[in-house]
Interface confidence: low
């Protein structure tokens, strides 16, 4: 695990005043902040929002932001007329840049954008844009809300009065009035092409401290179509120092964004500070809990007719403003079994909990590499058919990944099932050893801006030399990345794969739009037929409480991978709970309930929960059923079938579906999901075929951040 050994005090990087005008001076500014002792803060844990007040006294003030805006109590303010925007319709210059501050992603505006009206005391100049988002699948991520309803993303544009101050930073440091606009983003079925430059930029700042210039964009296009309906109140910065100097303009109508585009936000990484160790985490749920209104009055604009237009689509219609939720827990009992030397069968069971029935069908995605070329196919299987699919033309020298997702009404999706990695025909097995690195990582060329660091959050890769050919990786690919295209292949790192018999350098993380981007090819493979292996769900224990991680700075180096957001202790308790919203977003330990029954079974004996499994080397028979005849693969380029591994064309009858993320907006709130039984350790007696290799990647609980999990005390070492 790669540790940053931090020799200076733990200090913040990313509060609202942290971005400065000279791009090339940003490192100097960061050093200056560290030297000046600006307090470290975070969105959870020991440095979370309830602790901000200890180092930033204003955070305990009575006029704090964000707030929930209750429309019925908002007074129409006659002084709040049309906003006057100047420069917003111009394309941004090529000097406009984006930065991952570790707390948000910020756009530093280099052009002149001015706003006046709306009761602002003067003509204000836009300085920067910041974003706040949730954890996955359109979950609530906005800071403000209207009538208790939150949105997947909130964009905030900050302004200062250039007539009074020479810079935004000066206005803040002198505690003088600044302006801020809050714009909600809501999921819709199509990509919003106005956001393309922003989404593209996000892919270039995946890692903390990364900066990138942005393609030209029109700032007006990032605002709601109707600017006439807005709320006004006086509040604060939503991050330390929480200065109560902000005149907020909160727009009523949201801006559309697709799930596909949302994934770019969910793919951003940060570094979290634990004592003197920094670990790489996903930057998610970067919103401050809502604050009390106290004696403040929220006003609403008096722009004529602006509040009459389609009021139902926002204030009265829950469809519009509820954060989109997953429709079920993940499909469970994932199994991949060889049928013969050239065919595999994937099977699964329906989700245990369906929040928004019915399940219409299942999407099965599988990907592989062959001759350094990666491919991926996605196909559907109707829910009333057998929950299994046959993949033919399996190549012995390819690594395969499989995962399944349920599709409900309105194309709403479940969490992803555990992902299974399979490679046939090899006698090499992985002998895991605890990998610990200290110090700053050695940089080596990154393959793309999308490369992600390995991090196990608060867990350590380990297996202490116990040979196994079946590894569970708790990557948080359940609810916390549900609906995403994030791939589990990105957690199969060069270090891990070296032990698995793979050569080659680092694996780039998989961009959220493609699953996968790159997998290593096998270094050597024998020509024996693959034998069935038990599809266990958790080969190793859950993460322990320590903060080990293995980042490679800026995605450089040979170890990249995916992990989940926040650390979590063994018993599943969070270090810190922000508010009720996060409570309701707690995830179950997906996909472990029934599969746990199988863990201590030895192959090849059939187990009660998998009655159709055959002895080693044999074909699997499915009593009373034909083989799957309804699955159609598609590839990422539009469904072209190629000669590579795939479903037998003779078996195919249904229509092709693109393997894209859901881009629809859904009704319904998120019921509190029940906690599922704890994961059991794999006993030493578990045996696996050494001629076939599976690695399962489980949907971990939201805050379980890890790859190959570190065994807790009493677990397998």
């Amino acid at each position: 695990v790669l540790h940053y050994v931090v020799c200076f005090p733990a200090l913040t990087e990313g509060y609202v005043g942290a971005l400065h005008e000279n791009r090339h001076g940003s490192a100097v500014q960061i050093r200056r902040r560290k030297a000046s002792g600006d307090p470290y803060w975070a969105y959870s844990g020991a440095y979370g929002p309830e602790h901000w007040v200890t180092s930033s006294v204003s955070c305990g003030g009575r006029h704090q932001s964000p707030i929930d805006i209750l429309d019925q109590y908002a007074r129409v303010g006659e002084e709040y007329q049309e906003l006057q925007l100047d420069g917003f319709d111009n394309e941004s210059s090529n000097k406009t840049w984006m930065k991952n501050t570790g707390k948000t992603v910020a756009i530093l505006l280099k052009d002149d954008y001015f706003v006046s009206g709306a009761g602002l005391p003067g003509r204000f100049k836009a300085e920067k844009v910041e974003f706040h988002w949730g954890h996955s699948n359109g979950s609530a991520g906005s800071e403000h809300s209207i009538n208790g309803r939150r949105f997947p993303v909130e964009m905030q544009i900050f302004f200062y009065n250039p007539d009074d101050f020479d810079s935004f930073q000066t206005a803040i440091s002198e505690n003088r009035i600044i302006g801020a606009m809050a714009i909600f983003f809501q999921v819709s079925p199509r990509d919003n092409s106005a956001l393309d430059p922003i989404i593209h930029g996000l892919k270039g700042v995946v890692h903390h401290e990364k900066e990138t210039f942005l393609d030209p964009f029109v700032l007006r296009d990032l605002l709601p179509a109707s600017l006439g309906s807005y709320y006004r109140y006086t509040g604060s910065l939503t991050t330390p120092p929480c200065s109560e100097i902000v005149e907020w303009i909160v727009f009523r109508r949201p801006v559309p964004i697709s799930y596909h585009q949302l994934e770019a936000f969910y793919s951003i990484f940060t570094t979290e500070q634990q004592d003197h160790v920094k670990s790489v985490e996903y930057l998610r749920n970067n919103f401050r809990p809502q604050q009390r209104l106290h004696d403040r009055v929220v006003s609403k604009s008096a722009v004529r007719d602006s509040w009459n237009h389609d009021m139902t689509d926002f204030l009265e219609n829950p469809l519009g403003t509820e954060a989109s939720k997953v429709c079920s827990s993940p499909p469970i009992h994932m199994k991949v079994q060889p049928l013969n030397q050239t065919a595999l069968q994937v099977s699964w069971s329906q989700p245990e909990t369906i929040y928004h029935p019915p399940i219409m069908n299942y999407m099965i995605s599988y990907s592989w590499t062959k001759n350094e070329d990666e491919k991926e196919k996605t196909f559907t299987k109707d829910s009333d058919k057998d929950l299994k699919a046959t993949i033919s033309h399996v190549s012995p020298d390819s690594l395969y990944l499989f995962r399944v997702q349920a599709v409900c009404r309105n194309d709403m999706r479940s969490d992803f099932s555990q992902t299974m990695l399979f490679q046939a025909n090899t006698t090499r097995i992985f002998q895991g050893t605890r990998i610990v690195k200290t110090g700053v990582p050695t940089a080596s060329p990154a393959s793309s801006a999308d490369m992600a660091p390995i991090s196990s959050g608060s867990s350590t890769w380990t297996s202490s030399g116990i040979p196994f050919s079946f590894v569970s990786m708790a990557t948080g690919m359940g609810p916390s990345s549900s609906g995403s295209q994030a791939t589990v292949a990105s957690v199969v790192t060069s270090t891990l794969l070296a032990g698995l018999g793979f050569g080659g350098g680092g694996i780039s993380s998989f961009p959220s739009t493609v699953w996968p981007t790159r997998l290593p090819t096998a270094a050597s493979a024998s020509k024996q037929a693959a034998r069935p292996v038990l599809a266990t769900t958790e080969a190793l224990a859950s993460p322990g409480p320590d903060g080990d991680s293995s980042p490679t700075k800026d995605g450089e180096g040979t170890e990249e991978g995916e992990k989940d957001e926040k650390s979590e202790s063994e018993d599943g308790e969070r270090e810190h709970e922000e508010d009720g919203e996060k409570d309701s977003e707690k995830k179950e330990k997906s996909g472990v309930t029934h599969a746990a029954e199988e863990r201590n079974q030895t192959e090849p004996s059939p187990t009660p929960s998998s009655p159709n499994r055959t002895a080693e080397g044999g074909h699997q028979t499915i009593p009373g059923h034909e083989q799957d005849h309804t699955a159609v693969p598609t590839d990422q380029t539009g469904g072209r079938r190629d000669a590579g591994p795939g479903l037998d064309p003779d078996m195919v009858t249904s229509t092709q579906v693109p393997p894209t993320a859901t881009e629809e907006q859904y009704a319904g709130s998120d019921p509190k999901r029940p906690e599922m039984p704890s994961k059991k350790p794999m006993s030493r007696g578990d045996r696996f075929s050494e001629d076939s290799r599976f690695i399962t990647v489980n949907p971990a609980e939201k805050n379980t951040s890890g790859m190959i999990s570190r065994p807790a005390p009493g677990r397998m070492e």
Partner: antibody
Framework: QSLEESGGRLVTPGTPLTLTCTVS????????MGWVRQAPGKGLEWIGI?????STYYATWAKGRFTISKTSTTVDLKITSPTTEDTATYFC?????????????WGPGTLVTVSS | SFVLTQPASVQVNLGQTVSLTCTAD??????ASWYQQKPGQAPVLLIY???SRPSGVPDRFSGSSSGNTATLTISGAQAGDEADYYC?????????????FGGGTQLTVTG
């Protein structure tokens, strides 16, 4: 806020024709605009849309037969090679900026007749 | 291709309630909207997202959806409600997005 289509006329088959939708009261930089047609005595048929950034989407049957473009205040529909089946009233409609699949503002329509 | 099916014509007595249906194989996975079109006029949006009504549309018009059928219900039908009614939905996503209209239902108000 209003829309008005123009350019509809009698054309011979194969002669390209461009219809124009002129908008007032709102900005095309904030809305997607769609074209829908209706043959005499028939139902509505969605042709395609152009979104606020200029990206275009077409019905499967309309790809290659129609081209949608826009300026700051107008949206054009070009019928590349009209056939007699393209005889219809063509409506331009504004798509709700939030709910993509609903058109909340329509023009009165313009009639195109394709005949030899 | 994706097809929305509507009855060609429906009759209702003045003051009565009538339901117009729209079906498709996978409509349960999509949202429907409804439009009213009177002769010689442009369509008017009545319902979007299955059940939501734009401002200005009388509450006599309501939408619902069950299974693969979306329904527009007009309660207390009036002579002015005589028109063609179209359902619509979106099909596909991303670059393959398109909108689809049903064939329309001609509503006749008698009495």
């Amino acid at each position: 806020q209003s829309l008005e289509e123009s350019g509809g006329r009698l054309v011979t088959p194969g002669t390209p024709l461009t219809l124009t939708c002129t908008v007032s009261g709102f900005s095309l930089s904030s809305y997607a605009m769609g074209w829908v047609r209706q043959a005499p005595g028939k139902g509505l048929e969605w042709i395609g849309i152009i979104d606020s950034r200029g990206s275009t989407y077409y019905a499967t049957w309309a790809k290659g037969r129609f081209t949608i473009s826009k300026t700051s205040t107008t949206v054009d529909l070009k019928i590349t090679s009209p056939t007699t089946e393209d005889t219809a009233t063509y409506f331009c409609a504004r798509e709700d900026s939030y709910y993509y699949d609903s058109f909340n503002l329509w023009g009165p329509g313009t009639l195109v007749t394709v005949s030899s | 291709s994706f097809v929305l099916t509507q009855p060609a014509s429906v009759q209702v007595n003045l003051g009565q309630t009538v339901s117009l249906t729209c079906t498709a194989d996978t409509l349960s996975r999509r949202y429907a909207s409804w439009y009213q079109q009177k002769p010689g006029q442009a369509p008017v949006l009545l319902i979007y997202r299955d059940t939501s009504r734009p401002s200005g549309v009388p509450d006599r018009f309501s939408g619902s959806s069950s299974g693969n059928t979306a329904t527009l219900t007009i309660s207390g039908a009036q002579a002015g409600d005589e028109a063609d009614y179209y359902c619509a939905t979106s099909d596909g996503s991303g670059s393959s997005y398109q909108c689809v209209f049903g064939g329309g239902t001609q509503l006749t108000v008698t009495g």
